[in-house]
Interface confidence: low
């Protein structure tokens, strides 16, 4: 059987190193060797590259080496496959060396800001040594902020043949670290160099970008004053490196600016004690270069009726995100404030908040929340300076089985009945929404029975038991992830009821045990 016709010939010119062609098939059923015929010097010359029978049989690649690598030039390539039964030739292919030239990557030696020029970085690099001197090179500059995985790209060409090259990258963020990498190719080539080693540079610092401002309204105190917890953070889009030296807060009752109070703080939270009227609060951050734009917040009067527009809310999980969606009866509301914090009794919870614009959903990566923790999530509608009534829900990013089962006891033991009571599992041990309880009970040496009840039931009366019989029983609490058995208890049904005993006083000792 003749060898297969060589196809899919692909050639690449590694500048001043070699000219290599590959083809398929890579493997033949029987022993095959190959001959690659080349014409070069614009068709005036020809030579052969052979795969060595002893060591390179069945190897679908061959390289031509200097000094016969001519450039610029057009080559033709034809591959012959030969086995014991004969030879099969490929079609003739044509190659312009300028179009398939691959050169070394450039070497970036400096990424710096230029004094007085905002939001710009100047990149300096050395043109690759192994590149044709006269040719125009095209470049791709890839850049990203240091904490991002998403690369941006800019393409440009350089005609000059100076070894040191420069490019000014503009419209960047202030005071932000950027990672840069560069590749190049001859202008006509389809093959890019590899990427250069990455280099980091930082844009110039500016006055703070801005603040996001929020509040938690607390119940009025006995003296009528209202504690308001103000909190702020760098606005979305602010530079990662931005550091404020401090924050100026001023506030006053509506229409009464002569009662303005001012506060300076270095914290990102501050508790105000306000009267019952409407107040306006303003916060700016500052550094050595100036102040941020003013963040404004209206604190409603104590008796002000807040609007309500969120009608429903759903929390759902995707593979790696928690998504909260809500429906609103007010199409004009397009800004929302989302608060979330763990629902824990013991430790002070970490309170987080985030603004959402022009969407009725909010997404958080699962790994930003703790698995097995219940989170309270509230969404406030914000219409201009008014904040509406929140709508709240709870969510787990990952449920597990409860870390402890319900503590159980048996009460009102009768001849054929018993009332089982169990305690709710503490929040910290639930690890998910308790969806039901299952009571497993079994007479001594008897068959096990079970009864499942809703999660709002903490007591159940078992009936149709056998008189004067020892039973073991436990209650399992289940989340979506599975169930955990609680304390195992034993009880024994009575042999005779109080009524059957003729009304005499019967003191029946029963014990049940915990497991």
């Amino acid at each position: 059987v003749l060898p297969a016709k060589p196809e899919n010939i692909s050639c690449i010119f590694y500048y001043e190193e070699n000219f290599t062609c590959t083809w398929s098939p890579e493997k033949e059923a029987s022993y095959t060797w190959y001959k690659v015929k080349r014409t070069y010097s614009y068709g005036y010359k020809s030579d052969i590259c052979s795969t060595d029978n002893s060591t390179r049989g069945n190897h679908a690649s061959c390289s031509f080496l200097p000094p016969t690598i001519t450039n610029p030039d057009n080559y033709t390539i034809q591959v012959e496959a030969q086995n014991a039964d004969g030879i099969m030739k490929s079609d003739i292919t044509y190659w312009n060396l300028d179009a398939i030239m691959k050169i070394e990557p450039p070497e970036i030696f400096s990424v710096k800001s230029v004094l007085g020029i905002k939001r710009m970085l100047q990149i300096k690099w050395i043109r690759p040594v192994l590149a044709p001197h006269s040719s125009t090179l095209k470049y791709t500059l890839r850049f990203r902020t240091i904490n991002s995985a998403y690369w941006m790209e800019v393409n440009f060409t350089k005609e000059d043949i100076d070894r040191d090259e420069t490019y000014n990258l503009t419209e960047l963020q202030a005071f932000t670290e950027y990672v840069m990498t560069l590749r190049c190719a001859p202008a006509e080539s389809m093959f890019w160099s590899g990427w250069s080693q990455e280099k980091v540079g930082t844009t110039e610092e500016e006055a703070p970008y801005g603040l996001d401002l929020w509040r938690v309204l607390k119940p009025a105190m006995v003296d009528g004053r209202r504690p308001v917890q103000l909190m702020w953070k760098k606005a979305t889009g602010a530079p990662v490196l931005e550091k404020a030296l401090g924050y100026n807060i001023w506030y006053f009752p509506e229409n009464n600016t002569n009662l303005t109070e001012t506060v300076n703080t270095t914290n990102q939270t501050h508790e105000l004690y306000l009267g019952g009227k409407t107040y306006w609060v303003y916060v700016v951050s500052y550094n050595s270069l100036g102040e941020s734009p003013v963040a404004t917040l209206r604190i409603p009067a104590l008796n002000e009726k807040t609007f309500q527009c969120i009608e429903a809310m759903q929390a759902c999980l995707t593979q790696d995100q928690l998504v909260v969606e809500w429906q609103s009866s007010a199409p004009e509301v397009d800004t929302w404030m989302v608060e979330w914090f763990p629902d824990v009794d013991s430790e002070p919870s970490s309170f987080s908040w985030e603004s959402v614009s022009q969407a009725r959903n909010w997404t958080i990566q699962k790994d930003e929340l703790k698995p097995l923790w219940c989170y309270n999530i509230s969404v406030y509608p914000v219409l201009r300076d008014r904040v509406g009534q929140p709508y709240s829900t709870q969510a787990y990013v990952q449920e597990g089985i409860p870390s402890a089962g319900p503590v159980t006891q048996a009460d009102s033991i009768g001849v054929k009945t018993v009332t089982i009571t169990w305690k709710e599992i503490p929040k910290s041990k639930r690890n998910g929404f308790i969806k039901n309880y299952t009571i497993f009970y079994q007479a001594e040496d008897g068959k096990e029975f079970s009864k499942t009840v809703n999660s709002n039931i903490l007591q159940y009366r078992l009936e149709s038991l056998t008189r004067r019989t020892s039973y073991s029983l436990q209650v399992m609490a289940s989340t979506n992830a599975g169930g955990t058995n609680g304390t195992k208890i034993n009880f024994k049904t009575l042999s005779i009821s109080v009524l059957e005993g003729g009304g005499g006083s019967h003191h029946h000792h029963h014990h049940h045990h915990h497991h």
Partner: antibody, heavy 119, light 107 residues
Framework: EVQLQQSGAELVKPGASVKLSCTAS????????IHWLKQRPEQGLEWIGR????????EYDPNFQGKDTITADTSSNTAYLQVSSLTSEDTAVYYC????????????WGQGTTLTVSS | RIVMNQTPKFLPISAGDRVIITCKAS??????VTWYQQKPGQSPKVLIH???NRYTGVPDRFTGSGYGTDFTFTISTVQAEDLAVYFC?????????FGSGTKLEIK
């Protein structure tokens, strides 16, 4: 910090009764059971019984039923053990303890109250 | 009620000895056994729960094993600070019951 603080030592005459206290801090007794245990000099531990402070339900070892009474006051976060008709057999150290069912052990103990019954 | 028979009552030891204490339940208690250490004038402290699970912070020279009715508590290399009384306890069935205790004493 989770702690159980017991009342001080008692010297009581035979036939009298005594009420020992156990005050919790760092947790709410309504969220767990409080148990009482007895340890006579140079002897092992005996389980007297326990209370569910959330509803007052109790359970006793039959050996202590009628003799000992366990109560709780959730407003002061305190559990009590009353021992009546005291005899020399009641001379012991009495411990209150919180039981951790999730891992099957007493995870928090009071420091113990020494009760001496003597005429 | 379930009786926990603990042996020995007293155990003379020298530093570096291997200590083995046994507890035999009058009926199966599965693995619902806890071992406690009690030093003079102190409340008991958990060493092992669920028969073989070392409690948080307990040195690994303390081990427990067993299931059903026979349980063993071992101190691989006893140290001076281990002088104490050791109790087993079952919580499989109410009332909870304890072994009578094993007192480690210097030879």
């Amino acid at each position: 910090e989770v702690q159980l603080q017991q009342s001080g030592a008692e010297l009581v005459k035979p036939g009298a009764s005594v009420k020992l206290s156990c005050t919790a801090s760092g947790f709410n007794i309504k969220d767990s059971f409080i148990h009482w245990l007895k340890q006579r000099p140079e002897q092992g531990l005996e389980w007297i019984g326990r209370i569910d402070p959330a509803n007052g339900n109790t359970e006793y070892d039959p050996n202590f039923q009628g003799k000992d009474t366990i109560t709780a006051d959730t407003s002061s976060n305190t559990a009590y053990l009353q021992v009546s008709s005291l005899t020399s057999e009641d001379t012991a150290v009495y411990y209150c303890a919180r039981y951790y069912y999730g891992n099957s052990h007493f995870d928090c103990w009071g420091q113990g109250t020494t009760l001496t019954v003597s005429s | 009620r379930i009786v926990m028979n603990q042996t020995p009552k007293f155990l003379p030891i020298s530093a570096g000895d291997r200590v083995i204490i046994t507890c035999k339940a009058s009926q199966s208690v599965t693995n619902d056994v806890t071992w406690y250490q009690q030093k003079p004038g102190q409340s008991p402290k958990v060493l092992i729960h669920y028969a073989s699970n070392r409690y948080t912070g307990v040195p690994d020279r303390f081990t427990g094993s067993g299931y059903g009715t026979d349980f063993t508590f071992t101190i691989s290399t006893v140290q001076a600070e281990d002088l104490a009384v050791y109790f087993c306890q079952q919580d499989y069935s109410s009332p909870f019951t304890f072994g009578s205790g094993t007192k480690l004493e210097i030879k």
